[in-house]
Interface confidence: medium
Amino acid sequence: EDELQVIQPEKSVSVAAGESATLRCAMTSLIPVGPIMWFRGAGAGRELIYNQKEGHFPRVTTVSELTKRNNLDFSISISNITPADAGTYYCVKFRKGSPDDVEFKSGAGTELSVRAKPSAPVVSGPAVRATPEHTVSFTCESHGFSPRDITLKWFKNGNELSDFQTNVDPAGDSVSYSIHSTARVVLTRGDVHSQVICEIAHITLQGDPLRGTANLSEAIRVPPTLEVTQQPMRAENQANVTCQVSNFYPRGLQLTWLENGNVSRTETASTLIENKDGTYNWMSWLLVNTCAHRDDVVLTCQVEHDGQQAVSKSYALEIS
Amino acid sequence: EDELQVIQPEKSVSVAAGESATLRCAMTSLIPVGPIMWFRGAGAGRELIYNQKEGHFPRVTTVSELTKRNNLDFSISISNITPADAGTYYCVKFRKGSPDDVEFKSGAGTELSVRAKPSAPVVSGPAVRATPEHTVSFTCESHGFSPRDITLKWFKNGNELSDFQTNVDPAGDSVSYSIHSTARVVLTRGDVHSQVICEIAHITLQGDPLRGTANLSEAIRVPPTLEVTQQPMRAENQANVTCQVSNFYPRGLQLTWLENGNVSRTETASTLIENKDGTYNWMSWLLVNTCAHRDDVVLTCQVEHDGQQAVSKSYALEIS
């Protein structure tokens, strides 16, 4: 009679996380007498997965009734698979011995790979705001996926971006992987309502990619434009000068009026007008008593926006 | 048969405080017979972490069932890790002996480092107030973090500050560290509504820094400006003189009127007008009966603000 062979027909098996994995094994003979065990890995550090005769293995069930006479099928099913279960599984035949049973023959091994979904991508933007025409960086991260093959794309308002760099870690074999990508985005004045999107495609997602988003409103500062004009007034001894502060973002704005370089009034913008592109406008006016001045007056509208250095615009008021 | 080896596969393991640490250890043989123990540190002062056979180690669980026949995996998991658990852990095999078991072989050791979050930064300002144009110091403290690498930044109203000095203690190795930083801030008249922010970034914070704040309103004193003017009155024998006290902070203010150097009336400011910059204005008036005076009267408005030395402004009232 030919010597017993241990047949593991599949070289590899791929299972989605949470599902059960069936690992097949068959013997070609009933002799010699002795138990079958399943191990993950080989050598001294191998991990016992199932022992036919003793032990407690609640996640493992046998496909056949191992105790049936003439049974040669020693396939097992492992429930609730996680990425940590990945590895090579060996079906091993032992021969009864004293004091211990002796390993007789091992199967060739079946590599179990676990398909695990990537986590929802998290997109984060720059720590400080930047102004239009400048470039800012956004990062996208996702973890816990397997296998390693994955595709990441960046979009700005639906338009695909090309200036980005992506890493998948670790470089070697692992039970699961992480992806990290950094995209460089050039800001424009109209970007207050813009969005960047990080899109991840993976075999586990059945063609339905995961997306993470970030709003450019958190990353942009649009500095205001100033215009100072004199408005007509009925009263002869009064002049009304307005300062139109236009197209700024975010809201925070403090305006100071100076008469010949001396502070006349300071106010904080509150009731703003929002433009369609998400920027704001605001207007302030100053009533000047012309009787109080002999000579011409230089009126300056000075604006501090979002904690930045102040900008100003001046207007020469002629005293006739 | 080869002599037993004790395998500790990881040279180092890093764990976040509060999590569990898995320390892996495997034997290459079942012989000699004797228990396995885990220690922290080496030499005479080493600390017993786990004894396979006896003792009470509620934080330690074994990864495998140590009593299973042929078990060679003596990995352990230590729950609820704190910075005090940092150190090098050794898996040690003993050989049964009399009267005591004898140490047979030790693993190479696994260094456990603990990542611990810094405490919420506490920002404290100067003990006494200072006036605009002066420099005040703010301190920021945070404790209990590990590893030692940490970044601290100061901001005033969103603008990064550069004049500060930071120390991380202790200088040598420790289970956890503290940071102490002192920033020097130049006060301006508009700083009543200003804030200083101490921002701490650490590997444990996943890019979401901790912030501590202090209001400059606690540190600043803006001294008042005084203006004394005479208001027109219908009654011929009465003069109304007002003292306009402007742009002061904090509230505490006592005003005294003097007529030719003699105290006429003292009052404490109560109903104040708050300016947009957070400073206060207040006005006091004095009705002077001109009939009671033969000669011109010098009226003095004397103001004691926030416990400081009094300032005054005088006005000569002409008695026609």
């Epitope: - | 017993l48 972490i49 009267p99």
Partner: antibody
């Protein structure tokens, strides 16, 4: 739940032998050392010895060496302590304990002629 | 063998007071191997403190343990009526294992 249940009180004559049992539940006796401790009336605790039920290896305190035998039956999850050549000063409560953490309720042995 | 000497033999205190119980070893004991037990009349000893300073499950926080080398201490910050009992220190650093002779904590 871990439980150690000891056999009942014994009265013995000087020179006799007593064998006390300690049946455990909630764990496998092979997993831990089993200790025995003596407490004479109004006195403190005294360690007698221990067994490793996995391979029946024992350790004894010099004071009890030669008179005490500790055994274990892994099939019934029970440990035993046998003390021979009893004398009046052996009158005491005897405790079994699992790995120093869990104790039996104690067995009173009275040696009296 | 390592001899453990406990002091005082008897400690008479009132509820609310602080109690300090000492255990001195004739040679050095690693802190991992020093345990304390509480025993009340007619009951088996209960593990109270393990590895010098760790409270066993369910033991109130008013108890604490400290020490190293040859000198170990059990402290009760503010005595409660149920704390009055006998306390034993125990070493299992080397054979033969030994107990201290006990400290009886009684109500004054």
């Amino acid at each position: 739940e871990v439980q150690l249940v000891q056999s009942g009180a014994e009265v013995k004559k000087p020179g006799a032998t007593v064998k006390i049992s300690c049946k455990v539940s909630g764990f496998n006796i092979k997993d831990y050392y089993m200790h025995w401790v003596q407490q004479a009336p109004g006195k403190g605790l005294e360690w007698i010895g221990r067994i490793d039920p996995e391979d029946a290896e024992t350790k004894y305190a010099p004071k009890f060496q030669g008179r005490v035998t500790i055994t274990a039956d892994t099939s019934t999850n029970t440990a035993y302590m046998e003390l021979s050549s009893l004398r009046s000063e052996d009158t005491a409560v005897y405790y079994c304990d699992r790995g120093l953490a869990y104790w039996g309720q104690g067995t009173l042995v009275t040696v009296s002629s | 063998e390592i001899v453990l000497t406990q002091s005082p033999a008897t400690l008479s205190l009132s509820p609310g007071e602080r109690a300090t119980l000492s255990c001195s070893a004739s040679s050095s004991v690693s802190s991992s191997y020093l345990y304390w037990y509480q025993q009340k009349p007619g009951q088996a000893p209960k593990l109270w403190i393990y590895s010098t300073s760790n409270l066993a499950s369910g033991i109130p926080a008013r108890f604490s343990g400290s020490g190293s080398g040859t000198d170990f201490t059990l402290t009760i910050s503010s005595l409660e009526p149920e704390d009055f009992a006998v306390y034993y220190c125990h070493q299992w650093s080397s054979y033969p294992y030994t107990f201290g002779q006990g400290t009886k904590l009684e109500i004054k």
